[in-house]
């Protein structure tokens, strides 16, 4: 299944190499001089970078049920405080990633940083769980929200059949995969448009909300810090929900090698995005509270809908469309970024060789994109996705914390390393502690689910020894792997990146 990061297991040049004319050549073909290399291009500009980050952070949650924070704070004032604090802490994590991304100029995000600092085993475990469970399940969940909301205007007076939701979801997933397979530029352009839609939707909520405040609709802010059940013991859970809502700031680091002028673009994109998202989230919540009281917000499964029904009149009919577009943006951004994680992991020998190959004409990591399709479809038509993600939510913070701790380690181990962007040490230190705290909180608040998550994650250890370390694989297995790889190369028209040949 997986090779070690060396040349072919049978013979040198055991894979097919491409030429610039977009054909898989017979051996000995000479490449015409001055032609474009088959490799991923630096097409992610500052605007595209910002749209990737914002587009993947803002999903459907802020429109549907931003109640996890309020539920565990018990008061409007405290919930707004937590939203702000989580935004600042996420910015700290993002700044730490900005340093990592400009120091280690490779795509792959936390996988790459963990690999560089802590070695192959923890890095492999990370990508193993991401590929087999987290990413397919997460994509299926956000895609189901897309499916539900895109169909909603057509089923105003009756329930939407579950099968219809799943089928339209499957279409949505396929469109995202095709888009990301066909063109980096187009998926980035669409991401910019979808991010613009998201921000428009948020402004549509914020502006009337602020107008309500100006009109004196402040009843829900009176005694803002007194509320029912505002127990200090539940604040950590509120914090957990808040941090989860901001998760996604790390996605630009998955595509570092495709970022134009990464030393400048990555830190700038991260800072701009986090500022916009934090201000957007806090003001959206403020807007909600001008029209919906705390009890109603906790009850509702469609906060933006209730809000817009009351303040926007007929425009509320557009809310489901905006939510659907927001979900689609998250799907697109997530697939765009995470496919690069699989691409890099394959290049490092941690995933099948085919996943590190690039389409000869379109210059997209086609196999790394489409590998998600069947896995996501399996998730979509089976099992309890929410439970799966609950089991593994701790893993995200564990590995991100590990990556940021790696930054601190590198500061001491390699003090002379070139660091175009450098953050004060207290920032990664505080953020690493935050991640540690969140893993501990998972264990404390739900030891059963977290325990299952740990077990699932640890399946990566035997897998590592079986697929990566074990050299003496049977000859038939190696020959079959080669044949499958070559066949897929021909079908998909993909070759290894030229710099890596």
């Amino acid at each position: 299944m997986v090779r070690k990061p060396v040349v072919s297991t049978i013979s040198k040049g055991g894979y097919l190499q491409g030429n610039v004319n977009g054909r898989l050549p017979s051996l000995g073909n000479k490449e015409p001089p001055g032609q474009e290399k088959v490799q991923l291009k630096r097409k992610v500009t500052l605007l595209r970078g910002v749209s990737i980050i914002i587009g993947t952070i803002i999903g459907a949650g802020i429109f549907i049920s931003p109640k996890g924070v309020l539920q565990n704070t018990g008061s409007v004032g405290m919930s707004l405080t937590i939203w702000t604090v989580c935004g600042v802490l996420s910015l700290f994590g993002a700044l730490s990633y900005a340093e990592l991304g400009t120091t280690i100029k490779k795509s792959g995000g936390h996988y790459t940083y963990i690999l560089e600092v802590f070695g192959p085993l923890p890095a492999f475990v990370r990508v193993w769980v991401e590929l087999l469970i987290i990413r397919p399940a997460a994509t299926a969940v956000i895609s189901l929200a897309f499916g539900r909301y895109i169909l909603e205007p057509f089923f105003i007076q009756c329930e939407i059949p579950e099968l219809a939701i799943k089928l339209i979801t499957a279409v949505g997933i396929t469109v995202v995969m095709v888009l990301n397979s066909m063109s980096v530029s187009w998926s980035a352009r669409i991401q910019i448009f979808l991010t613009f839609c998201k921000l428009t939707a948020i402004l549509i909520i914020i502006v009337p909300g602020v107008m309500q405040l100006i009109k004196g609709q402040t009843q829900n802010f009176k005694d803002a810090f007194s509320g029912r059940d505002s127990s200090i013991t539940r604040l950590p859970l509120a914090f957990y929900y808040g941090m989860y809502a901001y998760a996604g700031w790390f996605y630009l680091n998955f595509v570092t090698e495709e970022v134009e002028n990464p030393e400048k673009t990555i830190p700038l994109a991260i800072c701009i995005s986090m500022a916009i998202v934090t201000i957007g989230y806090v003001l959206t919540n403020v807007a909600y509270f001008t029209t919906i009281n705390a009890e109603e917000l906790l009850l509702s499964n469609a906060v933006a809908v209730t809000f817009s029904e009351r303040l926007l009149g007929n425009f509320s009919l557009a809310v489901p469309i905006f939510v659907a577009l927001s979900c689609f943006g998250s799907m697109n951004g997530g697939v765009f970024a995470v496919s690069r994680l699989f691409y890099v992991a394959s290049r490092e020998g941690h995933l099948p060789e085919i996943l590190s190959m690039i389409h000869v004409r379109k210059h997209t990591p086609l196999p790394a994109v489409i590998v998600l399709h069947p896995l996501t479809m399996i998730m979509l038509f089976s099992g309890d996705l929410d439970s799966l993600l609950n089991f593994l939510s701790f893993a995200r913070w564990l590995f991100i914390g590990l990556a940021v701790a790696g930054l601190i380690y590198l500061r001491y181990k390699c003090p002379d390393m070139h660091r175009p962007f450098k953050v004060p040490l207290f920032i990664p230190a505080l953020f690493s502690f935050t991640c540690l705290f969140m893993v501990a909180l998972s264990l404390y608040s739900d030891p059963f689910s977290t325990g299952i998550g740990f077990v699932i994650t640890l399946t990566g250890v035997p897998a590592y020894y079986l697929f990566i370390i074990w050299d003496k694989k049977p000859r038939w297995f190696r020959i079959m792997s080669e044949k499958i790889t070559r066949t897929l190369q021909i079908i998909l028209e993909v070759v290894p990146e030229e710099d890596k040949l």
């Epitope: 109640k67 329930e159 009281n293 906790l298 509702s300 469609a302 209730t306 009351r310």
Partner: antibody, heavy 121, light 106 residues
């Protein structure tokens, strides 16, 4: 199809408490809020409050805070409303009701058959 | 809270007659919702978002209005329309119902 089955009529003494039930059939119980409405000849229909069985979130009409307590049991897909310190004013027909869809969270498409509560000594 | 005042409280109409039931809100609301209830039965959803008929509601029914003034109209009264009609708002918390208009057949 969607059905809301309410418990039978109750005759209770003043000062006592009563727990009315509403069993949900034909849909995923945890996906929708369950609301409770009181009906009397004098006051007509009055919204008491609601519970979201999925999250456990509740909302009450200020008038009924302290009087009604809403709970839900996911395992049996049943919503409950407990009324305490009963007086003759609490004699009424009580309905559980469910919104059609999230877009109209307070537009009630499905109603139980109603439970008649009589408070009398 | 927003108070909804329905008028008239009781009215009777002959078959074929046009009927209008009014609902006035104590402050402006975005939409009005209407329910029909017959004796011994639970209320039924009748009109949503001011003017949209719920499924199964005959086309002779219509709803209109904005701000604080809303109405339900039956273009041609039929025997089966005899019932009590309630208006409802959820523009402001808590949601409230009107006291009802009892429509009888003459």
């Amino acid at each position: 199809q969607v059905q809301l089955q309410q418990s039978g009529a109750e005759l209770v003494r003043p000062g006592a408490s009563v727990k009315l039930s509403c069993k949900a059939l034909g849909y995923t119980f945890t996906d929708y809020e369950m609301h409770w409405v009181k009906q009397t000849p004098v006051h007509g229909l009055e919204w008491i409050g609601a519970i979201h069985p999925g999250s456990g979130g509740t909302a009450y009409n200020q008038k009924f805070k302290g009087k009604a307590t809403l709970t839900a049991d996911k395992s049996s897909s049943t919503a409950y409303m407990e009324l305490s310190s009963l007086t003759s004013e609490d004699s009424a027909v009580y309905y559980c009701t469910r919104p059609l869809y999230y877009r109209y969270p307070y537009y009630f498409d499905y109603w139980g058959q109603g439970t008649t509560l009589t408070v009398s000594s | 809270q927003i108070v909804l005042t329905q008028s008239p409280a009781i009215m009777s109409a002959s078959p074929g007659e046009k009927v209008t039931i009014s609902c006035s809100a104590s402050s402006s609301v975005s939409y009005m919702y209407w329910y029909q209830q017959k004796p011994g039965s639970s209320p039924k959803p009748w009109i949503y978002r001011t003017s949209n008929l719920a499924s199964g509601v005959p086309a002779r029914f219509s709803g209109s209005g904005s701000g604080t003034s809303y109405s339900l109209t039956i273009s041609s009264m039929e025997a089966e329309d005899a019932a009590t009609y309630y208006c409802q708002q959820y523009h402001s918390y808590p949601l409230t119902f009107g006291a009802g208009t009892k429509l009888e057949l003459k």
